[in-house]
């Protein structure tokens, strides 16, 4: 029962997590800018992996997508790809684990094949979970560094003047989202893997057999039980261990008016 | 890198009319504002009227009935219609975009070559 517990909670905290990265990657405050006042209004600005975003104090929102690929940053296209490894891994490490889970039955599944579907996904959680904190991790350094940030500086450019303003980025919800999800996905992916220990089944080296003495009256049992005789007070017949999914436990034969010539 | 090119000034008589227009070319990301600068020969830049976006507008004082500035975001196209001309709007007209990059770049300011406009009769 613990087992079942550990399992469908730890899918169930991976799944929030991963709805969580999704969320994360598609977000556009992973970087925002403190809101300052120009001649007209205030003017908010905000940054995704993906695009750029203005909003005034109007309401007026403008987005715009990053215009090349080969001329983005090399840290911002890495924090890109750890993001959907991490979405991508998470992704089928919930597609494992839904066949893995104790409660649902799929044909003739043994217990050691979800064991090993369940460690499989508990991997894929953790790793997923990794890729999300460390891509998050690399934006928030990025951003605490400035790396495209000069003091205010004015250059001619083509056809004109361009000058640096200072500006100071923090961060923004995204990364938060983020954090947490990579999180609840990691300690999901720790919770499956806790849970494949106790589903995988136990290995015996040794056939369960009862010895008794020898009595007056010895019967034969059919059906793979071994003899027992008709004097003692241990009327359980035990089932020799055959490998199979029942346990020594599970099959007992109680005297009935046959056992005794 | 991104371009301002400017069009539209030159001679006009007083009372008359110009249209100023600036394009923005290049990889713009998101323009905060834009707007229109002016200096005058032997004086200091002046601001003429700003345009955000969302089309919120700023004029300089005494220029508010007769400059109208306005936008196509479309085209990241600022215009500057001036009417009822002086000798006192003799100038130099700078366009201006202040456009954030963000994480690509920061918050930068970009300034037009500017195009000369003479009121003289």
């Known amino acids: 029962m613990a087992v079942t517990a550990c399992q469908g909670l730890g899918f169930v905290v991976s799944l929030i997590g991963i709805a969580g990265i999704i969320a994360a990657t598609c977000m556009d405050q992973w970087s925002t800018q403190d809101l300052y006042n120009n001649p007209v209004t205030a003017v908010f600005n905000y940054q995704g992996l993906w695009r750029s975003c203005v909003r005034e104090s109007s309401g007026f929102t403008e987005c715009r997508g990053y215009f090349t690929l080969l001329g983005l940053p090399a840290m911002l296209q890495a924090v890109r790809a750890l993001m959907i490894v991490g979405i991508v891994l998470g992704a089928i490490g919930l597609l494992v684990s839904i066949f893995a889970l104790k409660c649902i039955r799929i044909g003739s599944m043994e217990d050691s094949a979800k064991a090993n579907m369940t460690l499989t996904s508990g991997i894929m959680f953790i790793v997923s979970g990794l890729c999300a904190i460390a891509g998050v991790s690399v934006f928030a350094n990025m951003l605490v560094t400035n790396f495209w940030m000069s003091t205010a500086n004015m250059y001619t450019g083509m056809g004109g003047m361009v000058q640096t303003v200072q500006t100071r980025y923090t961060f923004g919800a995204a990364l938060f989202v983020g954090w947490v999800a990579g999180g609840l996905t990691l300690i999901g992916g720790v919770m499956m893997c806790i849970a494949c220990r106790g589903l995988a089944p136990e290995e015996t080296n040794y056939k369960a057999v009862s010895y008794h003495a020898s009595g007056h009256s010895v019967a034969y049992k059919p059906g793979g039980f071994k003899a027992s005789t008709g004097f003692g007070s241990n009327t359980k017949n035990k089932k020799i261990y055959d490998g199979g999914a029942r346990t020594e436990d599970e099959v007992q034969s109680y005297p009935s008016k046959h056992d005794y010539v | 890198e991104v371009q301002l090119v400017e069009s539209g000034g030159g001679l006009v008589q007083p009372g008359g009319s110009l249209r100023l227009s600036c394009a923005a070319s290049?990889?713009?990301?998101?323009?905060?504002?834009m707007g229109w600068y002016r200096q005058a020969p032997g004086k200091g830049l002046e601001l003429v009227a700003t345009i955000t976006r969302g089309g919120s507008t700023n004029y300089q004082g005494n220029l508010k009935g007769r400059f109208i500035i306005s936008g196509d975001n479309s085209k990241d196209t600022l215009y500057l219609q001036m009417n009822s001309l002086r000798a006192e709007d003799t100038a130099v007209y700078y366009c201006?975009?202040?456009?954030?990059?963000?994480?690509?770049?920061?918050?930068?300011?970009?300034w037009g070559q500017g195009t000369l406009v003479t009121v003289s009769s």
């Open positions: 290049g990889n713009i990301l998101s323009i905060n504002y």
């Open positions: 201006y975009f202040r456009i954030n990059f963000g994480i690509l770049g920061g918050l930068r300011d970009y």
